[in-house]
């Protein structure tokens, strides 16, 4: 059904990391264009990416208004050059996306170790608190601002000279761990939201090792 020579979008997929959220779909258009609409459960549909030949639409600006709401998007297909044309039901051909709840589903971006500082047999490792596109009072919130205590970090650390790996967790962005004096250690961190059922963990951060530029050492 639908307008002649117009095909409905399919494989509608949310791609979201740290709330940067793109809707992707298929097929690449042949003689047709797309418009996307997004709504919460209120049914107040807002149009985005008007009459585009792209097969993706950045919906970040909409979802960051309330990351705890659940969203649905739909992609309308129109014949190129005749966007007023409608399908057999008297409206353009369209397909719905899966539902998407940013707070529960956005992927956690790869974290970065900001710094580490050794004082005697203690090392303080600090994770960069990445800025998101979520705003409050006209300022961008950090990942910690948004998730609060729901977000933890896991630290993996090991002696430069061995393969045995230890772990530590924190509800802040800092770790304080015990190390052996005179040994160099390597570190990697991972963001985790334990309460989630999907997308619970980020990928591991790049490895940083003592004796490299991010570290400070004090007796």
């Amino acid at each position: 059904s639908g307008t002649t020579n117009t095909v409905a979008a399919y494989n509608l997929t949310w791609k979201s990391t740290n709330f940067k959220t793109i809707l992707e779909w298929e097929p690449k258009p042949v003689n047709q264009v797309y418009t996307v609409q997004i709504s919460t459960k209120s049914g107040d549909w807002k149009s985005k990416c008007f009459y585009t030949t792209d097969t993706e639409c950045d919906l970040t600006d909409e979802i960051v208004k309330d990351v705890k709401q659940t969203y649905l998007a739909r992609v309308f297909s129109y014949p190129a050059g005749n966007v007023e044309s409608t399908g057999s039901a008297g409206e353009p051909l369209y397909e719905n996306s899966p539902e998407f709840t940013p707070y529960l589903e956005t992927n956690l971006g790869q974290p970065t170790i900001q710094s580490f500082e050794q004082v005697g047999t203690k090392v303080n490792v600090t994770v960069e608190d990445e800025r998101t596109l979520v705003r409050r009072n006209n300022t961008f919130l950090s990942l910690r601002d948004v998730f609060g205590k729901d977000l933890i970090y896991t630290l993996y650390y090991w002696k430069d000279s061995s393969t045995g790996r230890k772990t530590n967790t924190t509800h802040t962005n800092e770790f304080l761990i015990d190390v052996d004096k005179g040994e160099n250690y390597c570190f990697s961190v991972q963001a985790v939201i334990p309460s989630r059922t999907v997308n619970r963990k980020s990928t591991d951060s790049p490895v940083e090792c003592m004796g490299q530029e991010k570290g400070e050492f004090r007796e």
Epitope: S1, S39, K41, S42, G43, W45, A89, E95
Partner: antibody, heavy 118, light 106 residues
């Protein structure tokens, strides 16, 4: 607990008017689209109208278009259906329903009966 | 408008039976279909949305399947509380309901 309570039904003559109300509680009213569905005696369900959370988008079945008006007052958590130019075929139990995205109805009221007869 | 056709219109069954109700759409509605249960004098109750997603609190003996134009509601083992009328509803283009299937005691 999510609850919807309809009122305003009754007996009205053909050509007359009636306003139905639906009082909502137990959820953030403005976060959801709402709708009206009716059921004539001994018959199946018929969708009547839907309104978005802000009230900015409204939809009507062809059978009531131009005669019925759906509205809402989010400050009062209340949904309305203004029914004008009523006909015998509008006789039914009218249900108010919570309608995520305006698509399906996940919570229903108990219904209010409208009878159009001379 | 999209028409929804349910079959059968009446179904006689016994407690413990596996019951299947079919709903056909006049054109493809993808998976945008809901199922409701209604008992006499009561409001309908949502059972299934998006063709196969079970609404919270609905017993797991209810299941939905299908996409495109053909859909089924299955009750794996009919219970005394399940004797009622069942309606399908499409929400691909506006909203239309099927005519209903009454499940009665054999």
């Amino acid at each position: 607990e999510v609850q919807l309570l309809e009122s305003g039904g009754g007996l009205v003559q053909p050509g007359g008017s009636l306003r139905l109300s639906c009082a909502a509680s137990g959820f953030t009213f403005s976060d959801y689209a709402m709708g009206w569905v009716r059921q004539a005696p001994g018959k199946g369900l018929e969708w009547v109208s839907t309104i978005s959370g802000s009230g900015g988008l409204t939809y009507y079945a062809d059978s009531v278009k131009g005669r019925f008006t759906i509205s809402r007052d989010n400050s009062k958590n209340t949904l309305y259906l203004q029914m004008n130019s009523l006909r015998a075929e509008d006789t039914a139990v009218y249900y108010c329903a919570k309608a995520p995205y305006g698509y399906y109805m996940d919570v229903w009221g108990k219904g209010t009966t409208v009878t159009v007869s001379s | 408008d999209i028409q929804m056709t349910q079959s059968p219109s009446t179904l006689s069954a016994s407690v413990g039976d596996r019951v299947t109700i079919t709903c056909r759409a006049s054109q493809s509605i993808s998976s945008w279909l809901a199922w409701y249960q209604q008992k006499p004098g009561k409001a309908p109750k949502l059972l299934i949305y998006k063709a196969s997603s079970l609404e919270s609190g609905v017993p797991s003996r209810f299941s939905g399947s299908g996409s495109g134009t053909e859909f089924t509601l299955t009750i794996s083992s009919l219970q005394p509380d399940d004797f009622a009328t069942y309606y399908c509803q499409q929400y691909k283009s506006y909203i239309t309901f099927g005519g209903g299937t009454k499940v009665e005691i054999k």
